[in-house]
């Protein structure tokens, strides 16, 4: 047995005769032997479920699910309530009713085995019939929904009339039915006024009822119609059994180049027309289980459930529905020498399911893992400027394949053949297992015999020892000129573009910082800024070479305070500015300012944004927001 | 009200090793770079060292590279030098500065009454 | 290093004058410059920074001017208290130099 709401609502009146009809409550039946026998919890509650006092006022036919007044509550019955409820002024009441022999104790209400009673309270009497209007005549202030489980028998779920008035006004004629297209599960009997269902419900072919209820009053000579929404929702069973899409059970995949723990190296998906089991209880209740087999399988696989709710049409309705996504992922790195063919089983029970048949599908994996073979070009020809600075970034070197890599570790070193011109470094990039190349030794680069550069390029996987290696030549181009004196470590302090470009900075490859040119468009990615090399800072990623220097570029890599219109970076750096960011690394502070300080008030609210009250902040930056830029630009 | 507090000078023979310590109240510490700037009596001011908010990054002017070490404890709201193989042109009042900043650098908006450093045999 | 020269490097005037002091930079610091001021016995005390901007609570009469290498610090009365050593500093690249004071007496 189950309520057909989790929620009842009435009005009380002071001094309301005792005798009077409240409301029905009504329960649908899981199972067709099933008789209802309705009981009501001992106690009123009040405002955040205060317990006011045992309930010596409505009581319940069991049989029926009718409330009404034993005896009439009067005002000094309503005070001594009042009196109770934490000092809130009482406007609601609540009582709990049960559906026995369900819940035998009065705890928590919880739907289905229990709903709960809600009494708006009048500190008035009854208002005269005449002054009431045909909306109260008919349907009480809080909208009804209802909820009917599908598959079950069909029953009475609610009774349309307002019982009070019915009582108190019986010379107020009302009537009511219902606005249903044809064909539909619902019938309003023309004498008791309830509405019942015509037949069992399934909610896979609809799920929402969205209907009308019509009110018809009749008072005297005049006719007045009141229509309000009727809203029916089926609740879900597990009836029906998972199946596969399009009938594809079997998934093919090669593992070469992605070989990192926590790939997904193949999907397969199941349908299933329910949505139960509900979230929280999916993935205990829809289990997957990779059948076993050797050892090495296990080890290397698993298999993630990511369920997903979707929606499918039936009936010229949407309803919803679920579908399984069953990942098979490597669960750890795989080495480069791993070379075999396997097919891997998953069972899928969804362990709710009833039946008929069975709720159980076997899903196939055929996963072939491939070897990876290290590869360099032959050899690799590269310039650099005499006046480089430290960790210009001048190359890159890749195993054939390298940007496809991932969960494969690949070292890159250099070996100079003249001690005294081992001028570049190399480090591994984490993103895309390339090597890129810069300058470590600036001396080196100004003698004069070091101008041809000769390298051994050797790429390594530690875990198999195996190895490539290629040539490796770097002519060395220009003329040395002494940088400025005094110029600043970092290009990134450089606000504007003639002291951006007449200075060098750490990570400059031509010894001379570039300046790039912002959009102007408010806070932009696009920002101004003065940079070692444009081509590499800032681009919103601080890169491995990048991470030897905060000065070579703070516009990516700071992980201090930006002070002005900006968005941070994800994790660190300055994602997009307003105008021109400038930075100075050793204080971990950039700021972002307009490039033309023509707006007074956009100078007041970007060059000079500091901090509000720094104790009110606890020195957060107080970030412009790009509209109010705008609106400053406009104005 | 923002103070700033130097204690730990006085009188160190050369070769010797001192450490001055600047105690801070009125602004949120962590937020602030910091600096040392001394001055030799009857001379003008000279920048010694500087550190960030987080303490993760230090400088020192070439005069005093290797000898010395900057350091601050966010927690007690304390910056410190500390000063190793003392000479004799070491000897001046040392002041601590908060460091405030425009885009235009940084710039000294509060310092200490300073403490005096002597370096004499 | 970038080295700052400050002129003159002493300075005799009266109550109500009107004294411009002179900072030049080694080379260019485009409006990287502060000003301070220093009583005797006491710590520096920040009048202007970024060249031109007026720290709060420094009076009016201070004005500071300048771009590039040549830099000017004016005070349009002088008041008693001004009567003080006045230094500039340069904030654009480390280390980041004084220059060597400006010493201004009552005449």
């Known amino acids: 047995l189950y309520f057909s709401r989790d929620a009842y609502w009435e009005k009380l009146y002071v001094d309301q005769p005792a005798g009077t009809p409240l409301l029905y409550v009504h329960a649908l039946r899981d199972a067709p032997e099933e008789v209802p026998s309705f009981r009501l919890g001992q106690h009123l509650y009040g405002t955040y479920r205060t317990r006011l006092h045992e309930n010596n006022w409505i009581c319940i036919q069991e049989d029926t699910g009718l409330l009404y007044l034993n005896r009439s509550l009067d005002r000094s019955s309503w005070e001594k309530l009042s009196g109770r409820n934490r000092g809130f002024p009482l406007l609601t009441v609540y009582l709990k009713v049960f559906l026995s022999p369900t819940s035998l104790r009065e705890g928590e209400c919880q739907w289905p085995g229990c709903a709960r009673v809600y009494f708006s309270f009048f500190n008035t009497s009854f208002p005269a019939c005449t002054s009431l209007k045909p909306r109260e005549l008919c349907f009480p202030e809080t909208r009804p929904s209802f909820r009917i489980r599908e598959n079950r028998p069909p029953g009475t779920f609610h009774q349309f009339r307002l019982l009070p008035v019915q009582f108190l006004c019986p010379n107020i004629s009302v009537a009511y039915r219902l606005l249903e297209g044809e064909g539909l599960p619902f019938r309003c009997a023309p004498d008791s006024l309830e509405v019942s269902t015509r037949w069992a419900l399934d909610r896979e072919q609809r799920e929402k009822y969205e209907l009308v209820a019509v009110c018809t009053v009749h008072a005297g000579a005049r006719e007045e119609v009141v229509m309000v929404p009727f809203p029916v929702t089926v609740y879900d069973e597990d009836d029906s059994a998972p199946t596969f899409p399009a009938g594809v059970d079997t998934a093919s995949a090669v593992v070469e180049f992605k070989r990192k723990e926590d790939t997904v190296v193949a999907t397969l998906r199941v349908f299933d027309a329910d949505v139960v089991p509900a979230s929280g209880e999916l993935v205990r209740r829809y289990t997957s289980t990779l059948l076993p087999g050797d050892t090495w399988t296990q080890q290397t696989f698993r298999v993630e459930h990511w369920p997903n709710e979707t929606s499918v049409q039936a009936n010229g309705s949407f309803v919803r529905a679920t579908v399984h996504d069953y990942r098979l992922v490597l669960n750890r790195n795989l080495s480069i020498s791993e070379n075999r063919t396997m097919q891997l089983a998953v069972l899928v029970n969804d362990s709710d399911f009833q039946g008929p048949g069975a709720g159980v599908l076997l899903l196939h994996f055929n996963v072939s893992v491939l070897p990876v073979s290290l590869h360099l070009p032959s050899s690799y020809s590269l310039s650099v400027s005499r006046r480089a600075r430290r960790f210009a970034q001048i190359g890159k070197v890749c195993v054939e394949n390298c940007q496809a890599f991932s969960g494969i570790n690949v070292q890159y070193e250099l070996h100079s053949s003249g001690a005294n011109c081992s001028t570049l470094g190399v480090v591994t990039s984490a993103e895309d297992t390339s090597g890129i190349l810069f300058v470590n030794d600036t001396k080196a680069l100004r003698r004069p015999k070091c101008a041809e550069l000769h390298y051994m390029v050797v790429a390594t996987n530690h875990q198999t020892s195996r190895q490539a290696q290629a040539q490796l030549l770097v002519t060395v181009e220009g003329l040395y000129v002494a940088e400025e004196a005094g110029c600043p470590l970092s290009c990134a302090v450089s606000k504007r573009r003639p002291e951006c470009e007449e200075c060098g900075g750490l990570g400059s490859p031509t010894g001379r910082c570039e300046w790039r040119q912002g959009d102007g468009k408010g806070i932009t990615r696009n920002f101004s800024t003065c940079s070692p090399s444009t081509k590499t800072c800032p681009d919103g990623h601080c890169d491995v070479v990048e991470t030897q220097d905060i000065n070579i570029c703070p516009q990516d890599c700071l992980r201090g305070s930006i002070v002005g219109g900006h968005e941070p970076g994800e994790p660190r750096g300055i994602k997009a500015g307003y105008g021109t960011c400038n930075c100075f690394p050793e204080e971990e502070k950039c700021f972002c300012e307009p490039e033309d300080i023509q707006d007074p008030l956009c100078d007041e609210l970007c060059r000079e944004q500091k901090l509000i009250s720094e104790e009110d902040l606890g020195g957060e930056q107080k970030l412009i927001s790009e509209e109010d830029l705008h609106h400053h630009h406009h104005h | 009200e923002v103070q700033l507090v130097e204690s730990g000078g006085g009188l160190v023979q050369p070769g010797g090793s001192l450490r001055l310590s600047c105690s801070v109240s009125?602004?949120?510490?962590?937020?602030?770079?910091m600096r040392w700037v001394r001055q030799a009596p009857g001379k003008g001011l000279e920048w010694v060292s500087g550190?960030?908010?987080?303490?993760?990054?230090?400088y020192y002017a070439d005069s005093v590279r290797g000898r010395v070490t900057i350091s601050r404890d966010n927690s007690k709201n304390t910056l410190d030098l500390q000063m190793t193989n003392l000479r004799a042109e070491d000897t001046a009042v040392y002041y601590c500065?908060?460091?405030?900043?425009?885009?235009?650098?940084?710039?000294?908006?509060?310092w200490g009454q300073g403490t005096l450093v002597t370096v004499s045999s | 290093d970038i080295q700052m020269t400050q002129s003159p490097s002493s300075l005799s005037a009266s109550v109500g004058d009107r004294v411009t002091i002179t900072c030049r930079a080694s080379?260019?610091?485009?409006?990287?410059l502060n000003w301070y001021l220093q009583r005797p016995g006491k710590a520096p005390k920040l009048l202007v920074y970024?060249?031109?901007s007026l720290q709060s609570g420094v009076p009016s009469r201070f004005s500071g001017r300048g771009s590039g290498t040549d830099f000017t610090l004016t005070i349009s009365s002088l008041q008693p208290e001004d009567f003080a050593t006045y230094y500039c500093?340069?904030?654009?690249?480390?280390?980041?130099?004084f220059g060597q004071g400006t010493k201004l007496e009552i005449k």
């Open positions: 500065a908060k460091a405030e900043y425009s885009s235009s650098g940084a710039y000294f908006d509060y």
């Open positions: 009125g602004f949120i510490f962590k937020n602030y770079a």
């Open positions: 550190i960030s908010g987080s303490g993760g990054i230090t």
């Open positions: 080379q260019s610091i485009h409006n990287y």
């Open positions: 970024a060249a031109s």
């Open positions: 500093q340069q904030s654009y690249s480390a280390p980041y130099s």
